[in-house]
Amino acid sequence: DAHKSEVAHRFKDLGEENFKALVLIAFAQYLQQCPFEDHVKLVNEVTEFAKTCVADESAENCDKSLHTLFGDKLCTVATLRETYGEMADCCAKQEPERNECFLQHKDDNPNLPRLVRPEVDVMCTAFHDNEETFLKKYLYEIARRHPYFYAPELLFFAKRYKAAFTECCQAADKAACLLPKLDELRDEGKASSAKQRLKCASLQKFGERAFKAWAVARLSQRFPKAEFAEVSKLVTDLTKVHTECCHGDLLECADDRADLAKYICENQDSISSKLKECCEKPLLEKSHCIAEVENDEMPADLPSLAADFVESKDVCKNYAEAKDVFLGMFLYEYARRHPDYSVVLLLRLAKTYETTLEKCCAAADPHECYAKVFDEFKPLVEEPQNLIKQNCELFEQLGEYKFQNALLVRYTKKVPQVSTPTLVEVSRNLGKVGSKCCKHPEAKRMPCAEDYLSVVLNQLCVLHEKTPVSDRVTKCCTESLVNRRPCFSALEVDETYVPKEFNAETFTFHADICTLSEKERQIKKQTALVELVKHKPKATKEQLKAVMDDFAAFVEKCCKADDKETCFAEEGKKLVAASQAALGL
């Protein structure tokens, strides 16, 4: 449906408030270093222009594409070259190359200060003084730190953020009301950002086919009563939505997501019995609710898969006629029967099935050749099952912090070249799989754990891609999207690694550690642990544990001392000397 003016079309569809919010998100995700005020100015200019196009779609420049309009606007920023260096070269290009250039310069780890939460009274005053600016600032700060955040979902977060302040700034105990809500939004926001980052990586690095396969598997698990044709339609529409958002086309993405939610709710009866509550909610809540909806019950008496995909004499004929459709049907049928499998496992099974058909359909006796294909699935299913069992046992034995430490040691020994902050961040997140998934019954553990690990390992992959330092990481990240986790699991200690030279400064601590939150203190200790492994990769688990206990004793002692700083200086030297003597650092 061609419109004379795309910008007018989107403005009318989305409304002024959402239009402005989405343009702000788009600009902040592209120009991550620009001050808030500069972005607000650009957004206001674009909005004023959009209004002229709504009034008259034939007005000058109203027929231009959104990429052209937004790109031209971004390229008016005076300090582009000083602030962004070679990104300024994008402005010399024509669309669509210019937008591709901007996309390539998105930074997953921008050099921005950590967001420090002000006092509750300060936040409430700012909220009351200028609610609009306060909420815009939230969108801006999140978007620039998370350049792939799913924009329509960020609007939902902003709505909840506003609701939290509206309610809590009137409460008797503002802090008790507000802080848990902000913590929840922060944690959910980080998780949402990471999940979306995997979707974008899937599309950008492995292509539309990979994303569609993921979507077929996930939607078939979620909507097992829906027909294959219905699932295929949803997959096509969902792929369009995510392609747009990952490509920076946020207005189109939000508009199409709203259309998809509308379609799903209008066709609930042929999709899922679990959608009723979601579909009664307002738009942003509705879309979020649909995305998180629980799996519907499996239809009763589903026939055996073997009939159509192994025993039938028409397998090769059906495969040859439309390969991707036939594989899609296999994936749909397998996934709807297995909500207990992770999506990545289902995709591995589909890949194994595809490889077998490719080989066997060219053989003298195809049926004889592929007759035992389902037997090949057994080890693929057992591998994640065993891994999850072992790691959940370890988690239950150690608790989250020490489980994270075990993973820190494991991953530092696998890929010691990776930067310490990345190893700490990724291992801490890997360790959270325990509290997130091990509490679930067997039937829900694998989809929870392995699909979560895919999200976390993608963080490692995108951070490593920015500054590649390890061939092993590059190999695991690029060879196969669905085999990333097994690839990392299979890595042993890197025997080629030359231990890092000892630097006493790395192990120098100060009294400020005493006033840190428990989480920040853990991060300090975990940073020291990674550095220790980098210096002494052959140290045993027991030695590392003992040295970390010495470190804990040292911190505890000095935090109780009258002259903390002197204690840290003197006892810190002793701790380093003792560890050097014991480990031969």
Epitope: L398, Q543, A546, D549, D550, A553, K557, A578, A581, A582
Partner: nanobody, 124 residues
Framework: QVQLVESGGGLVQAGDSLRLSCAAS????????MGWFRQAPGKELEFVAR????????YYADSVKGRFTGSRDNAKNTVYLQMNSLKPEDTAVYYC?????????????????WGQGTQVTVSS
Amino acid sequence: QVQLVESGGGLVQAGDSLRLSCAASGRTFSDYAMGWFRQAPGKELEFVARINWSGTLTYYADSVKGRFTGSRDNAKNTVYLQMNSLKPEDTAVYYCAQRGDSGSNYDPSGYRYWGQGTQVTVSS
């Protein structure tokens, strides 16, 4: 199961010295820090010293600093507490303990295995 057996306690005069020993058997001795605690009559269990896994780092309670010295011999699975310039207020039952996997290094709850204790009495 870990077994800890203290020895070396006794009755001494103020200003004298004593050397306590604690022999361990069971799980790998050299993997864990060891602690010395004491309990005077009618008082709480009190931290005295922590000797790290390798014997290269020792922390003391302020009340014994400069007078007591902790050490260990991992080859013999034994930890020691050399007590000099003893005072009557050092009178207590002395316990050695092996560090657990969590909790404070200066609190009894942070230690998993305990000896039966040895009595030290300092007369004035």
